[in-house]
Interface confidence: low
């Protein structure tokens, strides 16, 4: 079955620049299928823009200005690229790639869409680092005791643009866990968002990951925030350093993200 | 030019109660096109639900039913037993792929219908309230309550900032909520919740006994290594403070 991935969840440009949006096709040979590009402007219907067929023929929707959009495909990387020249305010939209895919049953064909790339146009000069800054919250002991479950919370702050995707996984598992999240909120010139995951007691001793996709993540890769396993057994600690912490004080574990 | 017009911009549905979305075609006979339905969820994911010819996307056949009313020139999508997963924007779209002769394989979309899901009417349930802290950040977690109306107060004399609460449907069909704030005195912050003319405090849920059970953060792997931790021998960590952990990037 064909699958489409649009690695950029957003693409931020200043006026008159060129935007290149990528769509990676898997499960089907790109040179044996047609790739379609659609756009959804805010408050408007989703509209077909342009397609490139298996034999390289390009078809543009009537009314689309010539020279504005360029579509291409690179069989070696199984990628189709939509290039938007001279970006202007009216190009602000979410752009989707799509293809017709045959189902297992005969004669059954559906059009599948990629997850979309939001084109953002800004005139702001932003700080050098507008990637999401994480803070983690571990379950309260009261919750683990009373409800035999624990909630992890992943807070992400000071990011731009507002487009962000968060999901959770257990370590060594690719299964996406059912989580909940708040709306993305504006704070001055940047945004914040949080997501939380409630797990049963039996999963509390597993490491969990809050995985964050954002345009400005370092090196363009998903950021993984590790939530350590938590145990409900007695801990005895050997002397490590000469510490003056009182036993009644909090145990503060400082995590440093050395990759940032 | 043809136009697909949804019957409603927003449709509120209750969990488990069947709902029907309608989309009429203007300017052409609907029988000349194939109708498709898609759902767009948070994060813009466009998922195929149904296409004429009895084609359903994976996982949709049991809970959705697509139909065409030729006489009324409209397409119908029934959600047989809505769940919180069905929240999103639903789009009808048409194509003429496979109709012989000159065909178009592009989709023409209508505007979306926003489907909001709310729990089924049920007995009132009092929430559980828990506080989670990290540095100046405090989160108040409010779990499993019904109905939705709620006021969450993070009690502090030294507020830096507070955010609007997130209220979502829980997997069990009630509500969960989280309110976040930043406070200079985060250690002393508590959470009080007004719900159903009653007040519930996070302190009501604190474990009162001096237990030696506690949550032990384990050293993490990958690139996120804890800095050298300083432990007192045989340290007993107070259970209500175990979730305090800061992460600096």
């Amino acid at each position: 079955a064909g699958h489409l991935e649009q690695p950029q969840i957003s693409s931020t440009k200043t006026l008159s620049k060129t935007a290149r949006l990528e769509c990676v096709v898997s499960g089907i040979t790109i040179s044996a299928t047609s790739v379609y590009w659609y756009r959804e402007r805010p408050g408007e219907v989703i509209q077909f823009l342009v397609s490139i067929s298996y034999d390289g023929t390009v078809r543009k929707e009537s009314g689309i200005p010539s020279g504005k959009f360029e579509v291409d495909r690179i069989p070696e990387t199984s990628t189709s690229t939509l290039t938007i020249h001279n970006v202007e305010k009216q190009d602000i939209a979410t752009y989707y790639c799509a293809l017709w895919e045959a189902q297992q049953e005969l004669g059954k064909k559906i059009k599948v869409f990629g997850p979309g790339t939001k084109l953002i146009i800004t005139d702001k000069q932003l700080d050098a680092d507008v990637s999401p800054k994480p803070t983690i919250f571990l379950p309260s002991i009261a919750e683990t005791k009373l409800q035999k479950a624990g909630t992890y919370l992943c807070l992400l702050e000071k990011f731009f643009p507002d487009v962000i995707k968060i999901h959770w996984q257990e370590k060594k598992s690719n299964t996406i866990l059912g989580s909940q999240e708040g709306n993305t909120m504006k704070t001055n010139d940047t945004y914040m968002k949080f997501s939380w995951l409630t797990v049963p007691e039996k999963s509390l001793d597993k490491e969990h990951r809050c995985i964050v996709r954002h345009e400005n993540n370092k090196n363009g890769v998903d950021q993984e925030i590790i939530f350590p396993p938590i145990k409900t057994d007695v801990i005895t600690m050997d002397p490590k350093d000469n510490c003056s912490k009182d036993a009644n004080d909090t145990l503060l574990l400082q995590l440093t993200n050395t990759s940032a | 030019a043809i136009e697909l017009v949804p019957e409603h911009q927003t449709v509120p549905v209750s969990i488990g109660v069947p709902a029907t979305l309608r989309c009429s075609m203007k300017g052409e006979a609907i029988g000349n096109y194939y109708i498709n339905w898609y759902r767009k969820t948070q994060g813009n994911t466009m998922t195929f639900i149904y296409r004429e010819k009895d084609i359903y996307g994976p996982g949709f056949k049991d809970n959705f039913q697509g139909d065409i009313d030729i006489a009324k020139n409209l397409a119908v999508l029934k959600i047989l037993a809505p769940s919180e997963r069905d929240e999103g924007s639903y789009y009808c779209a048409c194509d003429t792929l496979g109709m012989g002769g000159e065909y178009t394989d592009k989709l023409i979309f209508g505007k979306g219908t926003r489907v909001t899901v709310e729990p089924r009417s049920q007995p009132h349930t009092k929430p559980s309230v828990f506080v989670m802290k990290n540095g100046t950040n405090v989160a108040c977690l409010v779990k499993e309550f019904y109905p939705k109306d709620i006021r969450i107060n993070l009690v502090s004399s030294k507020k830096i900032t507070e955010f609007d609460p997130a209220i979502v449907i829980s997997p069990s069909g009630k509500y969960n909520a989280v309110k976040l704030g930043k406070y200079e005195d985060s250690n002393s912050v508590t959470c009080s919740v007004q719900h159903d003319n009653k007040t519930v405090h996070s302190t009501d849920f604190e474990v009162k006994t001096d237990s030696t059970d506690h949550v032990k953060p384990k050293e993490t792997e990958n690139t996120k290594q804890p800095s050298k931790s300083c432990h007192k021998p045989k340290a007993i960590v107070h259970t209500e403070k175990v979730n305090m952990m800061s992460l600096t990037v």
Partner: antibody, heavy 122, light 111 residues
Framework: EVQLVQSGGGLVKPGGSLRLSCAAS????????MNWVRQAPGKGLEGVSS????????YYADSVKGRFTISRDNAKNSLYLQMNSLRAEDTAVYYC???????????????WGRGTLVTVSS | QSVLTQPPSVSAAPGQKVTISCSGS????????VSWYQQLPGTAPKLLIY???KRPSGIPDRFSGSKSGTSATLGITGLQTGDEADYYC????????????FGGGTKLTVL
Amino acid sequence: EVQLVQSGGGLVKPGGSLRLSCAASGFTFSRYSMNWVRQAPGKGLEGVSSISSSSSYIYYADSVKGRFTISRDNAKNSLYLQMNSLRAEDTAVYYCARDGPTVNWDYYFDLWGRGTLVTVSS
Amino acid sequence: QSVLTQPPSVSAAPGQKVTISCSGSSSNIGNNYVSWYQQLPGTAPKLLIYDNNKRPSGIPDRFSGSKSGTSATLGITGLQTGDEADYYCGTWDSSLSTSVVFGGGTKLTVL
């Protein structure tokens, strides 16, 4: 002009072989599933074989399974039917027919060739 | 013997209306789409109706199709002498790993 031009019919002895060809023009052949349909003298239509656009799916009527082979060459815009071990009951007019423009098929034939007569007789 | 059952013949006077039935089972008509073909004497079949009720461009609206359960019907109104032909229904049968299946055909005579 959109059309299907057939060739290759004729008289053949029982047990013999014959290859039918169908040349497509005026449309993008590689987008369409293709079919062979036959009609015995004075009888109705019988689906013989179907092939999807990329040859991923191939189907035969039970009466010809193991004896007939359908194939296509998208570069040459051509459809073929190789008929081996022919029997008297295979005598019919053979039509090639175009299906809907999908990866598989839409269960209807919107373009037909004129047909070619295959006679199996000793 | 055909998988789909049609009456061998029907007849009506010019200007009249006629219907031709096509009966099958849940594995063919019941779960798939039906097409109808017209075959004038000495010619190849021609598509009249597809997907139960859709008409290709160029086919007059005198021809209509419908489906209910495991049966399909072709309707012809305002009969003309040029409509005298054999009519076939066709569909897919999901229980047979076979090609498309047809009805035995119905000879329409315009009196």
